[in-house]
C-alpha cells in the first residue's frame, strides 16, 4: 500500500532528488529576482552594496568545471543558511520601511527554509556529512540607520540572487555527472 502520507519517500535515484532541489532553487531564484526588482523600484539603489557579514560567492565560471557534489551541496547549504539568517534579521530589525515588503520577505524566508530542508535531505540520502559552518555565525548587529538597512537589503537580495543563479547552474551540471 506504500508509505503513509506525509512520510518521506525512499528514493533509489538521487537524480530525482537533485531535480527537486533544482526546481526549488529555480523557484526561489525567481522570487528573489522579483523582490530585488521591487526593492529597486521602491528604494532605488545608488550603486552596488556590500555587507561584510554575507558569504563570499562560492562559484564562478572558472570553477564550474571542477565542481564536486559533496563540496557544492555543503557550501550551498552553509551559504543559504547565512542568507536565511540575514533575511530573518531584515524582517525583524530593518525598520518600518521594509515592513511594506513584509509578505514577500516572509514568503522568501519560508521558501529558503524549504530549500535548506531539501538540501539536508539530499545530503543524508547521498550519505554526505552534514558539515557545520567553518566559523560560528556572527551575530548581526542593529542597523546604523534606516538608510543603512535599505542598503543592506539591496546587498542581501543581490547576493542571494547571485548565489542561487550559480547554484542552479552547478546543480544542473552535477546532475549530468551522477
Amino acid at each position: 500500500p506504500g508509505p503513509p502520507a506525509g512520510s518521506p519517500r525512499v528514493s533509489s535515484d538521487p537524480r530525482a532528488d537533485l531535480d527537486s532541489a533544482v526546481l526549488l532553487t529555480r523557484s526561489l531564484l525567481a522570487d528573489t529576482r522579483q523582490l530585488a526588482a521591487q526593492m529597486r523600484d521602491k528604494f532605488p539603489a545608488d550603486g552596488d552594496h556590500n555587507l561584510d557579514s554575507l558569504p563570499t560567492l562560492a562559484m564562478s565560471a572558472g570553477t564550474l568545471g571542477s565542481l564536486q557534489l559533496p563540496g557544492v551541496l555543503t557550501r550551498l547549504r552553509v551559504d543559504l543558511m547565512s542568507y536565511f539568517r540575514h533575511v530573518q534579521w531584515l524582517r525583524r530589525a530593518a525598520g518600518p520601511s521594509l515592513k511594506t515588503l513584509e509578505p514577500e520577505l516572509g514568503a522568501l524566508q519560508a521558501r529558503l527554509e524549504r530549500l535548506l530542508r531539501r538540501l539536508q535531505l539530499l545530503m543524508s540520502r547521498l550519505a554526505l556529512p552534514q558539515a557545520a559552518p567553518d566559523q560560528p555565525a556572527v551575530p548581526l548587529g542593529p542597523p546604523a540607520s534606516a538608510w543603512g538597512s535599505i542598503r543592506a537589503a539591496h546587498a542581501i537580495l543581490g547576493g542571494l540572487h547571485l548565489t542561487l543563479d550559480w547554484a542552479v547552474r552547478g546543480l544542473l551540471l552535477l546532475k549530468t555527472r551522477l
Epitope: K42, A93, A94, G95, P96, S97, P142, S145, A146
Partner: antibody
Framework: QVQLVESGGGVVQPGRSLRLSCAAS????????MHWVRQAPGKGLEWVAV????????FYADSVKGRFTISRDNSKNTLYLQMNSLRAEDTAVYYC??????????WGQGTLVTVSS | QSVLTQPPSASGTPGQRVTISCSGS????????VNWYQQLPGTAPKLLIY???LRPSGVPDRFSGSKSGTSASLAISGLRSEDEADYYC???????????FGGGTKLTVLG
C-alpha cells in the same frame, strides 16, 4: 551631538488644526526614519506615526488615521505633524524621535498640545 | 488599554534586584525586537535596552533585558534611588503596522 527640537504646540479648540515641527541637527537626517510619540498628562506613551528616511513610507496609529499627516523636508532637516480635526483626547506632550530600526535612540524635549474649548 | 501588558508598579530597596515584565503576543514581541525606555519625572523618555538585550553606551550594566516567546523582562540589579522612574517596553506590531507600548511601570525605590 544629536538634537531634536519640537515646536508648534499650544492651546487649540476642538475641530481646529495645528502643525508641529521638529528641527533635527547633529546627524544625517535623511538617513533615519522618524516618529511622533505622544503622552497625555499623567498617562503612558502612545505611538502616533512614522515616516521613512526618504518620505515614501508612512504608518499611523488607528487613533489618528485620516486626521494626522506626517511629513518631512530633508533639505531643511525638519519633521512635521499636521493635525486636523483635533479632539480633547489629542491633548498631550508630542515628542519626535529618531530611529535606526524600531527603537527610538534620541527624543526631543516635547511640545504640549492642549485641545480645549 | 495597552497592547503590551506591564505591571503598573514595582518597588525595591537600594541594592536589591527588581524585575519588570512585559507581555505581548506573536504579532509584536513574538516576532519583533523589544525595547525598554526609562522616563524620569518631567523629562523625555530615554532608551535603556534595545534589540531585546542590548544596552546603548552610557547605560550601566545594572540594567539588562531578556525575552522568551511573547514575553520580555527588564532586570535592574543594585537598585539606586536615581532609578526611580517610569519604565516602558515597546515593540513593532505586525498586525497593527505600528509601534506598541506597554502601559508603563512606576518603579519606587524604598527607604
Amino acid at each position: 551631538q544629536v538634537q531634536l527640537v519640537e515646536s508648534g504646540g499650544g492651546v487649540v479648540q476642538p475641530g481646529r488644526s495645528l502643525r508641529l515641527s521638529c528641527a533635527a541637527s547633529g546627524f544625517t537626517f535623511s538617513h533615519y526614519d522618524m516618529h511622533w510619540v505622544r503622552q497625555a498628562p499623567g498617562k503612558g506613551l502612545e505611538w502616533v506615526a512614522v515616516i521613512s528616511y526618504e518620505g515614501s513610507v508612512k504608518f499611523y496609529a488607528d487613533s489618528v488615521k485620516g486626521r494626522f499627516t506626517i511629513s518631512r523636508d530633508n533639505s531643511k532637516n525638519t519633521l512635521y505633524l499636521q493635525m486636523n480635526s483635533l479632539r480633547a483626547e489629542d491633548t498631550a506632550v508630542y515628542y519626535c524621535a529618531r530611529t535606526p530600526g524600531f527603537h527610538f535612540d534620541y527624543w526631543g524635549q516635547g511640545t504640549l498640545v492642549t485641545v480645549s474649548s | 488599554q495597552s497592547v503590551l501588558t506591564q505591571p503598573p508598579s514595582a518597588s525595591g530597596t537600594p541594592g536589591q534586584r527588581v524585575t519588570i515584565s512585559c507581555s505581548g503576543s506573536s504579532s509584536n514581541i513574538g516576532s519583533n525586537y523589544v525595547n525598554w525606555y526609562q522616563q524620569l519625572p518631567g523629562t523625555a523618555p530615554k532608551l535603556l535596552i534595545y534589540y531585546d538585550d542590548l544596552r546603548p553606551s552610557g547605560v550601566p550594566d545594572r540594567f539588562s533585558g531578556s525575552k522568551s516567546g511573547t514575553s520580555a523582562s527588564l532586570a535592574i540589579s543594585g537598585l539606586r534611588s536615581e532609578d526611580e522612574a517610569d519604565y516602558y517596553c515597546s515593540a513593532w506590531d505586525d498586525s497593527l503596522s505600528g509601534v506598541v507600548f506597554g502601559g508603563g511601570t512606576k518603579l519606587t525605590v524604598l527607604g
